[in-house]
């Protein structure tokens, strides 16, 4: 008897199943069809909160949530201060924008990086015009 | 609505102990900047006692005085604590929580208070 | 760091202005980390000016502040008979560590 299933009917890594009387695809989450050949929209009816988009792949819906918030749905304010990323004692807060360093005398740039000279001069490196001390992270 | 509660006050003995809660709600420490302690002694001013991080970081800021014998930890995203020891008649006051938010490139701004909860320290 | 409010008490008619000092012994973080609350008895403070002068969300743009590094003022002005409570100041510093100082309170009375 000849193994039907040898020839792959199945599309998108479906599983063939042969019954006897007639061949069947089980097919892998996000696909449809008789033989699997339908892609599903994997974020058809899926909402990312915040912001967040929806990404499809391997059948399973994934969402890029946008800065500031995480999770599966990126309903989970996510703590952008967790890795104390301000430098030299700058107070970090958890900002709309992402964080914000409040740099202490002596220090700026985004993270607090940079010592400022005593002549008010910064030992900064070409850095994007228009930064201020204390300035957000966009 | 955003809401902040103290709970914990009452009498307690000279050098006693106590551990003061506030609690958050309409919002989680997380996506704030600071929860804080603030104590008014009756019909004196204000005082500011300590500060910790709303995130994980667990970051703490304490007034000199207050050092030793306070201690503020984060006990859930809606809960901070303010354990107090070796207390004396002179921390007899209403302890206040605060939320320190960062706006203008300022920061110790206290936006959101609550009502306060009173510790009497008496023999 | 010591900031001193004066006078207290004040007292004007309603309609009328009030000014109230502050002076710090050195220099607020950044020239401008000082705020003003307004409490009343039996009542947490509640925020009126940050940044020296900017006047926080609800508030009336009869409350005016202003002033930068170690000498601030608050001005009310149309005073109003909601006006009466008691009025601190606030500065934030940096030395080896944050931490913040209030004024000791300037009590307003509206006549």
């Known amino acids: 008897r000849v193994d039907r299933c040898s020839l792959q009917p199945c599309r998108n890594g479906g599983l063939c199943l042969d019954l006897g009387h007639a061949l069947r695809c089980r097919c892998r989450a996000g696909f449809a069809g008789p033989r699997c050949e339908h892609d599903l929209d994997d974020c058809a009816g899926r909402a990312c909160a915040n912001g967040g988009t929806c990404v499809e792949g391997g059948g399973a819906h994934r969402c890029s949530c946008a800065l500031g918030f995480g999770g599966r749905d990126c309903r989970e304010r996510a703590d952008p201060c967790a890795a104390r990323p301000c430098a030299h004692g700058g107070r970090c807060y958890a900002h709309f924008s992402g964080l914000v360093c409040a740099c202490a005398p002596g220090y700026m740039g985004a993270r607090c990086e940079f010592p400022v000279h005593p002549d008010g001069a910064s030992a900064l490196p070409a850095a994007p015009p228009g930064l201020r001390p204390g300035d957000p992270q966009r | 609505q955003e809401q902040l509660v103290e709970s914990g006050g009452g009498l307690v003995q000279p050098e006693g102990s106590l551990t003061l809660t506030c609690t958050a709600s309409g919002f989680s420490f997380s996506s704030s900047g600071y929860m804080c302690w603030v104590r008014q002694a009756p019909g004196k001013g204000l005082e500011w006692i300590a500060c910790i991080s709303g995130g994980s970081s667990g970051d703490t800021d304490y007034a000199n005085w207050a050092k030793g014998r306070f201690s503020i930890s984060k006990t859930s995203s809606t809960t901070v604590t303010l354990q107090m020891t070796s207390l004396t008649v002179a921390d007899t006051a209403t302890y206040f929580c605060?939320?320190?938010?960062?706006?203008?490139?300022?920061?110790?701004?206290?936006?959101?208070w609550g009502p306060g909860t009173l510790v009497t320290v008496s023999s | 760091q010591v900031l001193t409010q004066t006078p207290s008490p004040v007292s004007a008619a309603v309609g009328g202005t009030v000014t109230i000092s502050c002076q710090a012994s050195?220099?607020?973080?950044?020239?401008?980390?000082l705020a003003w609350y307004q409490q009343k008895p039996g009542q947490p403070p509640k925020l009126l000016i940050y940044a020296a002068s900017s006047l926080a969300s609800g508030v009336p743009s009869r409350f005016k502040g202003s002033g930068a590094g170690t000498q601030f003022t608050l001005t009310i002005s149309d005073l109003e008979c909601d006006d009466a409570a008691t009025y601190y100041c606030q500065g934030t510093y940096y030395s080896s560590g944050w931490y913040s100082t209030f004024g000791g309170g300037t009590e307003v009375v509206v006549k």
């Open positions: 050195q220099s607020v973080y950044n020239n401008n980390n």
């Open positions: 605060a939320r320190d938010v960062y706006i203008d490139s300022t920061i110790f701004n206290f936006n959101l």
